[in-house]
Interface confidence: low
């Protein structure tokens, strides 16, 4: 008879999760010479150890510390790009601007991007049927705690001018409840970070409003200024042109505003 299994509201662990994590680790360490020393089996063991056999609503940041330690990586000053609710464009940008990095361009973020995982208390099994949903079940689930942990670390290690890409099409351009608003903003270190520059990405081609005047952006400015970090904001009216100009900065059309 099949053993009773806890039913959660969220989708289950991504199929071939162990193989995917290992394969991504292999690919990442081959492409990034500075991470050549990483033993992918140890990375997987540490990842697994964070959630296997543990009640999936009682995961802590401490559970992920062995993994965080193995995946330690530094980003050069002025090269950190945070994002909120606009992941695809942020990733397209760093794929072109290869010297800037989002969390998903780092080993640990790359391993887990778009994956779901959870285990079960007191068994060595991975639960492929269902995993806890952040809202409906619990916030201390394996996936949410992972992203909170690595996002905190990513923000803590940032230095110089930090950039953040924000989605100007959303009702809350800056959302205090997003990972950026609840974790990263509060873990930027004022002694290392001189400024945060927000890039507000416009959605409609005819949208010429100054979204840097949006109340939520003013709220972000207030939070950042209180932490003794300077704040700048830039409207990106034409994201398609913005990317094109990152690729070809000498293009004559790129000398005008974007």
């Amino acid at each position: 008879l099949p053993r009773w299994r806890q039913q959660w509201s969220g989708s289950g662990t991504t199929s071939r999760f162990p193989e995917t994590v290992l394969a991504r680790c292999v690919k990442y360490t081959e492409v990034h010479p500075e991470m050549r020393h990483v033993d992918c089996q140890s990375v997987w063991d540490a990842f697994k150890g964070a959630f296997i056999s543990k009640y999936p609503c009682n995961i802590t940041e401490e559970d992920y510390q062995p993994l965080v330690k193995l995946g330690t990586q530094t980003v050069p000053c002025n090269k950190t790009l945070l994002w909120s609710r606009i992941k695809d464009l942020a990733h397209q940008f760093t794929q072109v601007q290869r010297d800037m990095f989002t969390l998903e361009d780092m080993l640990l973020g790359y391993l887990a991007d778009d994956l779901t995982w959870c285990g079960e208390f007191n068994t060595f099994e991975i639960n492929y049927q269902s995993c806890p949903d952040w809202r409906k079940d619990c916030s201390n689930n394996p996936v949410s705690v992972f992203w909170k942990t690595v996002s905190r670390r990513f923000a803590e290690t940032a230095c110089g001018v930090v950039h953040v890409m924000l989605n100007g099409s959303r009702s809350k351009i800056f959302d205090k409840n997003s990972t950026f608003g609840s974790v990263e903003v509060h873990n930027l270190q004022p002694e290392k970070v001189q400024a945060l520059e927000a890039w507000v990405i416009h959605g409609g081609r005819e949208d010429s409003r100054d979204l840097c005047q949006d109340p939520t952006i003013k709220e972000l400015e207030s939070i950042i200024s209180k932490r003794n970090i300077r704040f700048f904001c830039k409207n990106i009216y034409r994201p398609d042109k913005f990317l094109q100009c990152v690729k070809n900065p000498e293009d004559s059309s790129c000398l005008s505003g974007i």
Epitope: R16, E19, L22, K27, E30, H37, V38, D39, Q41
Partner: antibody, heavy 123, light 110 residues
Framework: EVQLLESGGGLVQPGGSLRLSCAAS????????MSWVRQAPGKGLEWVSD????????HYVDSVKGQFTISRDNSKNTLYLQMNSLRAEDTAVYYC????????????????WGQGTLVTVSS | QSVLTQPPSASGTPGQRVTISCSGS????????VSWYQQLPGTAPKLLIY???QRPSGVPDRFSGSKSGTSASLAISGLRSEDEADYYC???????????FGGGTKVEIK
């Protein structure tokens, strides 16, 4: 089920060329490094060459450097070994072997093997 | 001449324990993991042990691997007639930038 099927072996004269192929199925081919390992009649195993998941890194045993070329076509799930200037001492069964998911050398092992293809170099 | 050194043969009676040694150097076994393969007559090799002592699923726990310094060993306990085969150790050699095998050990059942 993981399957590796070698082909392209046969009888060739000294100085001749052969191209071995290894068709892979049952796994995500471009997740893995791949290798060629050979075994001369009545002798032990000898690693010949390996290639990383994307073809970006290749390595060869000293005795075949400049003579053999390993390559892969991930769109066709196929591994190749181009063998030139063949000598009698290259006579062997050539096995295609799937590497581990690790690129890091310390963890490299051969998890699955094909049945091999016999290469005979003789006049 | 193989980079890793194994005894050419080993034997035992059914039920006995047989140990095969594999000796290398700091650039291979000393620094890297060891794997073991079984090759039954007329067949392709099969992975028995990886990462020094890990068994792939389906390999009986009669087979065990260990490593100390620049030497490794494979132990077969409760020897059975189907264990009659050639056994090879393998490691990566950092100085050669490639994999290396032992010369193989033929295990015979007396």
């Amino acid at each position: 089920e993981v399957q590796l099927l070698e082909s392209g072996g046969g009888l060739v004269q000294p100085g001749g060329s052969l191209r071995l192929s290894c068709a892979a199925s049952g796994f995500t081919f471009d997740d893995y490094g791949m290798s060629w390992v050979r075994q001369a009649p009545g002798k032990g195993l000898e690693w010949v060459s390996d290639i990383s998941w994307n073809g970006g890194k290749t390595h060869y045993v000293d005795s075949v450097k400049g003579q053999f070329t390993i390559s892969r076509d991930n769109s066709k799930n196929t591994l190749y070994l181009q063998m030139n200037s063949l000598r009698a001492e290259d006579t062997a069964v050539y096995y295609c072997a799937r590497g581990s998911l690790f690129h890091d050398s310390s963890g490299f092992y051969f998890g699955h093997w094909g049945q091999g293809t016999l290469v005979t170099v003789s006049s | 001449q193989s980079v890793l050194t194994q005894p050419p043969s080993a034997s035992g009676t059914p039920g006995q324990r047989v140990t095969i040694s594999c000796s290398g150097s700091s650039s291979n076994i000393g620094d890297n993991y060891v794997s073991w393969y079984q090759q039954l007559p007329g067949t392709a090799p099969k992975l028995l042990i990886y990462r020094d002592s890990q068994r792939p699923s389906g390999v009986p726990d009669r087979f065990s691997g260990s490593k100390s310094g620049t030497s490794a060993s494979l132990a077969i306990s409760g020897l059975r007639s189907e264990d009659e085969a050639d056994y090879y150790c393998q490691s990566y050699d950092s100085s050669l930038s490639g994999s290396v095998f032992g010369g193989g050990t033929k295990v015979e059942i007396k």
